[in-house]
């Protein structure tokens, strides 16, 4: 059974992940057309099911494409000082949270998502898990 300290650690990690994802989303939401129009042509794959920490495997698999988008669409109004570091930090948190005991084959939904929908989906996931922990 998880101890209160491990639960607290998980909660902190989720909150950190949540803040990182929200920071990216806020930056993108500040983009003006036609830049936003261009960014929305990037497609992301969504999990069929995301209710447990192990489902973070699906986020991990899409981090490379996310990094690519953020690098390509760097902006003077929203400049992530080091996209590589940010994605690397997210990756470290995701790996710790999902654990490595079980290697899950991610099942993706048939529909793809824009970067905005993708980030919102994983933000909702973090919020949902945090609420069950608190």
């Amino acid at each position: 059974a998880p101890t209160s300290s491990s639960t607290k650690k998980t909660q902190l990690q989720l909150e950190h992940l949540l803040l990182d994802l929200q920071m990216i989303l806020n930056g993108i939401n500040n983009y003006k057309n036609p830049k936003l129009t261009r960014m929305l042509t990037f497609k992301f794959y969504m999990p069929k099911k995301a209710t447990e920490l192990r489902h973070l495997q699906c986020l991990e698999e899409e981090l490379k494409p996310l990094e690519e988008v953020l690098n390509l669409a760097q902006s003077k109004s929203f400049h992530l000082r080091d996209t590589k570091d940010l994605i690397s930090n997210i990756n470290v948190i995701v790996l710790e949270l999902k654990g490595s005991e079980t290697t899950l084959m991610c099942e993706y939904a048939d529909e793809t998502a824009t970067i905005v929908e993708f980030l919102n989906r994983w933000i909702t996931f973090c919020q949902s898990i945090i609420s069950t922990l608190t």
Partner: antibody, heavy 121, light 113 residues
Framework: EVQLVQSGAEVKKPGESLKISCKGS????????IGWVRQMPGKGLEWMGT????????RYSPSFQGQVTFSADKSISTAYLQWSSLKASDTAMYYC??????????????WGQGTTVTVSS | DIVMTQTPLSLPVTPGEPASISCRSS????????????LDWYLQKPGQPPQLLIY???YRASGVPDRFSGSGSGTDFTLKISRVEAEDVGVYYC?????????FGGGTKVEIK
Amino acid sequence: EVQLVQSGAEVKKPGESLKISCKGSGYGFTNYWIGWVRQMPGKGLEWMGTIYPGDSDTRYSPSFQGQVTFSADKSISTAYLQWSSLKASDTAMYYCARQGRSYYYFGMDVWGQGTTVTVSS
Amino acid sequence: DIVMTQTPLSLPVTPGEPASISCRSSQSLLDSDEGNTFLDWYLQKPGQPPQLLIYTLSYRASGVPDRFSGSGSGTDFTLKISRVEAEDVGVYYCMQRIEFPLTFGGGTKVEIK
């Protein structure tokens, strides 16, 4: 090796239907937009539009909207260009080309060999 | 639609000599916010499909010799070949991808004198 292989040359009569194909290999076919480009005899290149095989999202250039249909079968890594009723003016070479994860942010870095379509009565 | 205009229509060249092709767009291809210029150059050799030479104004595509270079700003662009080789003959096209629909220039035919 990353490549796009197109179906063979076609000779058709006006009013007939046609579907040509473009099969990708050596990369994650579903993750890249596939553009279609027309080249009429002795003329330049025209971008017809693009399809994302991962979800079959299509974007048509206004000049080609309603004239052609793009489709894709991701299970066999193949994109298609089709006409329901060919006209003599459809006579051209048609190329498919890989357009990256976004057709705005990437050039067309891999091209099919082209499919010649001849429409004549 | 953005109109892309190339000059000259035809360019006779001497092997070993430099050559340059111009391309002009009817509106700016520069996104000043992100600093990208959404212009590519393609070469179509006789009897072959086009191939990507230069993307995003000045980046050489994989396997493209360094004698090819792209430059320009806003609406005026140039493709330069520092020393033309016999294998460089064909039709060169510029293409914009800042705005839908993507559009090509009419092409410049490069041939050996």
